[in-house]
């Protein structure tokens, strides 16, 4: 499978909410022995590999924000901890995987990465990730609502080992 990032850039005004999205593409194994570990974290555009560095989102680590579920299930974070920080990650039946950030501030600007690990416990792991930029703006130049910029097809279907 691959991870697509439908949008590579989100430009939002301060105080707005935004939902960053990744999408699983291609065949997804729905066997009973297959589970998916999905999470989000902040990173920086490394010279060697984007998303190699894992930094917290609003002080929450990728482990705090992770989901795990079977291949055919939906899931979302019900952690009070995440919601207290204005965050919620979710995954649906159609391969969409998102994180919602509420009440954005300038400090939320940066590179965000989604990570998906397909796990056949004791057998195999397949990891892919996607990256997108969030720019939070303030003042007269800020948009009134979030503006999203589609990824090029090359970017959005790029498979990268995490």
């Amino acid at each position: 499978f691959k991870v697509a990032t439908p949008y590579s850039l989100y430009v939002c005004p301060e105080g707005q909410n935004v939902t960053l999205t990744c999408r699983l593409l291609g065949p997804v194994d729905k066997g009973h022995d297959v589970t998916f570990y999905k999470t989000w974290y902040r990173s920086s555009r490394g010279e060697v590999q984007t998303c190699s560095e894992r930094r917290p989102i609003r002080n929450l680590t990728f482990q705090d924000l992770h989901l795990h579920h079977g291949g055919h299930q939906a899931a979302n974070t019900s952690h009070d901890l995440a919601q207290r920080h204005g965050l919620e990650s979710a995954s649906d039946h159609h391969g969409n995987f998102s994180i919602t950030m509420r009440n954005l501030t300038l400090l939320d600007s940066g590179l965000y990465c989604c990570l998906v690990v397909e796990i056949r416990h004791h057998h195999s792991e397949h990891r892919v990730h996607g990256a997108m930029e969030l720019q939070v703006q303030t003042g007269k130049d800020a948009p009134s609502n979030c503006v999203v910029y589609p990824s090029s097809s090359q970017d959005s279907e790029n498979i990268t080992a995490a």
């Epitope: 589970t35 482990q63 795990h68 990570l115 416990h121 004791h122 057998h123 990891r127």
Partner: antibody
């Protein structure tokens, strides 16, 4: 069944390789883990090689141990043993949920 | 690092009584991959329970596992002399790299 071998008395810093030999099943179909137990102490997970060949180690074990696999054996190399590595070393088969089959263990003593 | 805390470290039980052992993980165990092992001196560990509550083949139904997330329990009912041993919990974690961890063990002494 599983049988560990290679345990012996070694001096600190002398590399040592332990071998786990399987009989009655194919190693290529299973994950294989290594666990150790110091005298009078509890079980301590060292690492595992899963079916695809990926190898994972406990954070404390990285650099100290190397796991490798052939068609008939799984090896654990202790790169530079210290007295703290004195223990019985077990290999165990990963059965998809946990470790369902264990060897009897082999004793490694590190002493100068 | 993952820490698995087992309590109590030692427990005394009368024949026919009940023993409860608790295992608490510092992070949520992945997909309920939590097992319990019994070990007697000079022997390798023996699997009792896997997936938190599934009894391993050939194991007495007097052993019962329960729990989810970070907290798990092993209950031994109708304790017998042969149950005298050390019991360990073992959990699997993906963070996101694979890690297994063992609890510190609980010694069960049967009176």
């Amino acid at each position: 069944s599983l049988e560990e071998s290679g345990g012996r008395l070694v001096t600190p810093g002398t590399p040592l390789t332990l071998t786990c030999t399987a009989s009655g099943f194919s190693l290529s179909s299973y994950a294989m883990g290594w666990v150790r137990q110091a005298p009078g102490k509890g079980l301590e997970w060292i690492g595992i090689i899963i079916v695809s060949g990926n190898i994972y180690y406990a954070s404390w074990a990285k650099g100290q141990f190397t796991i490798s696999k052939t068609s008939t054996t799984v090896d654990l190399k202790i790169t530079s043993p210290t007295t703290e590595d004195t223990a019985t070393y077990f290999c165990a088969r990963g059965d998809g949920y946990t470790y369902g089959l264990w060897g009897q263990g082999t004793l490694v003593t590190v002493s100068s | 690092d993952i820490v698995m805390t087992q309590t109590p470290a030692s427990v005394e039980a009368a024949v026919g009584g009940t023993v409860t052992i608790k295992c608490q993980a510092s992070q949520s165990v992945y997909s309920r991959y939590l097992a319990w092992f019994q070990q007697k001196p000079g022997q390798p560990p023996k699997l009792l329970i896997y997936s938190a509550s599934t009894l391993a083949s050939g194991v007495s139904s007097r052993f019962k596992g329960s729990g989810s997330g970070t907290e798990y329990t092993l209950t031994i009912s109708g304790v017998q002399c042969d149950d005298a041993a050390t019991y360990y919990c073992q959990g699997t974690f993906y963070i996101p790299d694979y890690i297994d961890g063992f609890g510190g063990g609980t010694e069960v002494v049967v009176k």
